[in-house]
């Protein structure tokens, strides 16, 4: 069947937007104004994924370019990518484990916990102009809070 | 509380076109497809499409496309489904429902219906 | 399109009675599949979605359950309110569609 999308763009709790910090890597920082254009625009993809109440199974495409966010081990810790992919098979309903993430909402406000791992989530720091990350731990210095706004598609 | 209120009942002739509306409260309009259902007397349960108010998504049933235009005012948090060229065969009951972004609750607030009569 | 096969058409039973109505889908729908109760001249109300997530309100004498392609939905004791008709609805792939119905009868 084929998968079902959205446009949209995330900022984190601290209302950093995310952009493009070469090739294959997301930065956070604060952007305003006509600064705005240069966040990145995700699909958001619905997939398959394990049945739960509060967790809705997602994959996070870079609109309209072949790239994803995934998760694969790099000297046995959990890192997050951006992968490239063939277009013809992607986006699908049964996205490979590495790129789908547990989407938890509350309150409007977004985690993604990776499916590969679980307890690890899209992360941001605290500071301006970092790397998004994934990171192991919730509530601490790190965010892992995200706000979601549709795009037009 | 969550609610959908759609406009009054229609009577048209055939070939003219009729507007329905479907006006929301209680829940943050933009997070939510608002669906169209049809109901033809004494039948079941029809599709018609789908509209994420502020998205610019909108998705239709093949059969729908052409006959059906679904729109949303986002200042007013009310969705619009205009149909053209009508014919007896339009003669129904049309329901607006939600369903939120993710797709995951299913439809689950309907309005009170809109019973579009075609008849010369 | 997908086809939702619902069964029976119509049924009668009594009150305190266990019923049980099945809709087949003709192809998987990765369990985006709803019920809905519709009385004559009122808009669906929503039961289940997910195959088995009763919507908040919604008696516990109703449940879901699936095996395979089969979807099922099992009133426990046929309460008075009950007699209605019932709705299964895929909205797993466009076009959304739903099973043509069973009008539950009091015996």
């Known amino acids: 069947a084929p998968v079902r999308s959205l446009n949209c763009t995330l900022r984190d709790s601290q209302q950093k937007s995310l952009v493009m910090s070469g090739p294959y890597e997301l930065k956070a920082l604060h952007l305003q104004g006509q600064d705005m254009e240069q966040q990145v625009v995700f699909s958001m993809s619905f997939v398959q994924g394990e049945e739960s109440n509060d967790k809705i199974p997602v994959a996070l495409g870079l609109k309209e370019k072949n790239l994803y966010l995934s998760c694969v081990l790099k000297d046995d810790k959990p890192t997050l990518q951006l992968e490239s992919v063939d277009p013809k098979n992607y986006p699908k309903k049964k996205m490979e484990k590495r790129f789908v993430f547990n989407k938890i909402e509350i309150n409007n406000k977004l985690e993604f916990e990776s499916a590969q791992f679980p307890n690890w989530y899209i992360s941001t720091s605290q500071a301006e102009n970092m790397p998004v990350f994934l990171g192991g731990t919730k509530g601490g210095q790190d965010i892992t809070d995200f706000t979601m706004q549709f795009v037009s598609s | 509380q969550v609610q959908l209120v759609q406009s009054g009942a229609e009577v048209k002739k055939p070939g003219a076109s009729v507007k329905v509306s479907c006006k929301v409260s209680g829940y943050t309009f933009s997070r939510y497809w608002i669906e169209w259902v049809r109901q033809a007397p004494g039948k079941g349960l029809e599709w018609i499409g789908e509209?994420?108010?502020?998205?610019?998504?909108?998705n239709y049933n093949e059969k729908f496309k052409g006959k059906a235009t679904i729109t949303a005012d986002t200042s007013t948090d009310t969705a619009y489904m205009e149909l053209s060229s009508l014919r007896s065969e339009d003669t129904a009951v049309y329901y607006c429902?939600?369903?939120?972004?993710?797709?995951?609750?299913?439809?689950?607030?309907w309005g009170q219906g809109t019973l579009v009569t075609v008849s010369s | 399109d997908i086809q939702m096969t619902q069964s029976p058409s119509s049924l009668s039973a009594s009150v305190g009675d266990r019923v049980t109505i099945t809709c087949k889908a003709s192809?998987?729908?990765?369990?985006?599949l709803s019920w809905f109760q519709q009385k004559p001249g009122k808009a669906p109300k929503s039961l289940i979605y997910?195959?088995?997530r009763l919507v908040d309100g919604v008696p516990s004498r109703f449940s879901g359950s699936a095996s395979g392609t089969d979807y099922t939905l099992t009133i426990s004791s046929l309460q008075p309110e009950d007699f209605a008709t019932y709705y299964c609805l895929q909205y797993d792939e466009f076009p959304y569609t739903f099973g043509q119905g069973t009008k539950l009868e009091i015996k």
């Open positions: 997910r195959v088995k």
């Open positions: 192809q998987d729908i990765d369990r985006y």
């Open positions: 509209i994420l108010p502020g998205s610019g998504n909108i």
């Open positions: 429902s939600t369903i939120y972004y993710d797709y995951d609750q299913g439809f689950t607030y």
